[in-house]
């Protein structure tokens, strides 16, 4: 990608925390070794990253979680990549599915996600989970972030 | 990217090579259907991707192994994704984690690994795994690499 | 990426489609959240992305499957990413495996493969699957796709 | 109920400067984009600037950039927009409006540039 | 930037009768699976109204008489049976590309 003012990188890699909220949205931090190339993509309110600049990115996510089936509902662990633009706009982009491992107290297991997708100005993406107290924030195991094509 | 002499395109993916050497950190070789781009990346003793040029890169790594959970100890499977930057400690950059299958005599399963980080020139990127034993070394199934944005 | 005439951004993105075909190769098409940057990637019969201009590519699959050990093969569900360039074999350039789940009816896992390739002017890229019967074509789960570095 | 009020019209000299406000009332201020739309006496609608929610990305119509600035401050639920070098084409009622699809507006404001 | 053109710059209908306004823009306003379509409605002396978003979805308290179709370059207001306080001036607005766009306005009359 251009480095020039026109064409900056733009980039973000930001990583799990751990929260006490009950909600299913992700939450995330600029801590340890994460990435945040400049302010054309930002991490707001720790759950979404927001982009200034309309066009191709390439988003991903990596959500490692430890179940276990007698403990968990029927339904497998779900990750899903979604899209929030201004305007009504909230759509899944990504979805990954894993049934819960028969391991005891509870097997981990890793799900990645990746694409390219257009976002447009002001256009947010976050990380939805079927269960967040699953999700396990050790070092590297749970990371989320994007690059601008 | 530019194609110039001042942004010349960096890339590489290599393939998983088995070992008899005991340590945790997978081997790779430019063979089969490898990416070396040019010499501003390198493979280095067949175990690290070490870049000459600071900037952001998405570095990746798919692993794939057979495992079974009375064969193998409680913990899981464990690949890592890690830095060595010249005069610093090596840090783990991703994480992901998979429970052994009950499958006989093995059950394989594959994990998938990738984000963006900033490199420093002389920075090395390398996979460590639980137990290099039970990786797949089948066409395809394990594999490294990074690009440049 | 430029967005100059010389060095057009090329990605695309690509939804699973089911398919009556026995075939082991997944069907694809460019609805819901797809991408198409331009004419010189294409989707060629709902199977494989084709692309007009040589370069590297970073290219992507992501399939989900719901699976059952004993209604199975003990062989795993294994998919791969393969290359078909004008004039020469296919070649498998990427390969993930897992077991089958003890769920019942079935259990889904998901899979995700990625790396960096050199393809050739008119080279085409396609995913095959053990048990295409198996993939799970809801919103999100199984895609496809690549991005010219 | 969604309310929104501007304020800081008025009469202005061409090169001058004006601070329009929006205060906002019924609904989480933060969680949404606002818009400046404009609409000069007898004529159609045109938009002027938005400005995303918590960072504070901010877009401008060709017509205003670089003289006008649009900010918001989420704990007072207001916006604004300061407008400097002030031109007789920008003559004009200002409305707010809530999110990219304009689903609520202000009443408007009118900013008058002569001489 | 992308134009937006709509058509008639006015239309007299009797009431009861369908008015039907048209709006063009000069590439199109699809992102993925929507059209980044809305329609106002201004009476004189007050601020516009959002009538339909996303070309179809009719807003919440507007009566549904009012309908949005097309996809692409080419979008339809349409006013099934016109009342008296349906008399103004409806816009179509594009937000697919910065800068947001508005068409240039077509005045409803009745016949």
């Known amino acids: 990608m251009q480095k020039g003012d026109q064409n900056p990188q733009i980039a973000a890699h930001v990583i799990s925390e751990a929260s006490s909220k009950t909600t299913s949205v992700l939450q995330w931090a600029e801590k340890g070794y994460y990435t945040m190339s400049n302010n054309l993509v930002t991490l707001e309110n720790g759950k979404q990253l927001t982009v200034k600049r309309q066009g191709l990115y390439y988003i991903y996510a990596q959500v490692t979680f430890c179940s276990n089936r007698e403990a968990s509902s029927q339904a497998p662990f779900i990750a899903s990549l979604c899209l929030k633009s201004p305007g009504r706009f909230e759509r899944i982009l990504l979805r990954a599915a894993n049934t819960h491992s028969s391991a005891k107290p509870c097997g981990q297991q890793s799900i990645h996600l990746g694409g390219v997708f257009e976002l447009q100005p002001g256009a947010s993406v976050f990380v939805n989970v079927t269960d967040p107290s699953q999700v396990s924030h050790g070092t590297g195991f749970t990371s989320f972030g994007l690059l601008k094509l | 990217m530019q194609k110039g002499d001042q942004n010349p395109q960096i890339a590489a993916h290599v393939i998983s090579e088995a070992s008899s050497k005991t340590t945790s950190v997978l081997q790779w070789a430019e063979k089969g259907y490898y990416t070396m781009s040019n010499n501003l990346v390198t493979l280095e003793n067949g175990k690290q991707l070490t870049v000459k040029r600071q900037g952001l890169y998405y570095i990746y790594a798919q692993v794939t192994f057979c495992s079974n959970r009375e064969a193998s100890s409680q913990a899981p499977f464990i690949a890592s994704l890690c830095l060595k930057s010249p005069g610093r400690f090596e840090r783990i950059l991703l994480r992901a984690a998979n429970t052994h299958s009950s499958a006989k005599p093995c059950g394989q399963q594959s994990i998938h690994l990738g984000g963006v980080f900033e490199l420093q020139p002389g920075a090395s990127v390398f996979v460590n795994v639980t137990d290099p034993s039970q990786v797949s070394h089948g066409t395809g199934f394990t594999s490294f690499g990074l690009l440049k944005l | 990426m430029q967005k100059g005439d010389q060095n057009p951004q090329i990605a695309a993105h690509v939804i699973s489609e089911a398919s009556s075909k026995t075939t082991s190769v997944l069907q694809w098409a460019e609805k819901g959240y797809y991408t198409m940057s331009n004419n010189l990637v294409t989707l060629e019969n709902g199977k494989q992305l084709t692309v007009k201009r040589q370069g590297l590519y970073y290219i992507y699959a992501q399939v989900t499957f719901c699976s059952n050990r004993e209604a199975s093969s003990q062989a795993p569900f294994i998919a791969s990413l393969c290359l078909k360039s004008p004039g020469r074999f296919e070649r498998i350039l990427l390969r993930a495996a897992n077991t089958h789940s003890s769920a019942k009816p079935c259990g889904q896992q998901s899979i995700h493969l990625g790396g960096v390739f050199e393809l050739q002017p008119g080279a085409s890229v396609f995913v095959n699957v053990t048990d295409p019967s198996q993939v799970s074509h809801g919103t999100g789960f199984t895609s496809f796709g690549l991005l010219k570095l | 109920e969604v309310q929104l009020v501007e304020s800081g019209g008025g009469l202005v000299k061409p090169g001058g400067s004006l601070r329009l406000s929006c205060a906002a009332s019924?609904?989480?201020?933060?969680?949404?984009?606002m818009s400046w739309v404009r609409q000069a006496p007898g004529k159609g609608l045109e938009w002027v600037s938005e400005i995303s929610t918590v960072h504070t990305y901010t877009y401008y119509s060709d017509a205003v950039a670089g003289r006008f600035t649009i900010s918001r401050d989420n704990a007072k639920n207001s916006l604004y927009l300061q407008m400097n070098s002030l031109r007789a084409e920008d003559t004009a009622v200002y409305y707010c409006a809530r999110d990219r699809v304009l689903d609520y507006w202000g009443q408007g404001t009118l900013v008058t540039v002569s001489s | 930037d992308i134009v937006m053109t709509q058509s008639p710059d006015s239309l007299a209908v009797s009431l009861g009768e369908r008015a039907t306004i048209n709006c063009r823009a000069s590439e199109s306003v699809e992102y993925y699976d929507t059209s980044l379509m809305q329609w106002y409605q201004q009476k004189p002396g007050q601020p516009p109204k959002l009538l339909i978003y996303?070309?179809?979805n009719l807003e919440s308290g507007v009566p549904d008489r009012f309908s949005g179709s097309g996809s692409g370059t080419d979008f339809t207001l349409t006013i099934s049976s016109l009342q008296a306080e349906d008399v103004a001036v409806y816009y179509c607005?594009?937000?697919?590309?910065?800068?947001?766009?508005f068409g240039q306005g077509t005045k409803v009359e009745i016949k």
């Open positions: 996303a070309a179809s």
């Open positions: 607005q594009q937000t697919k590309k910065l800068p947001w766009t």
């Open positions: 019924g609904f989480t201020f933060s969680d949404y984009a």
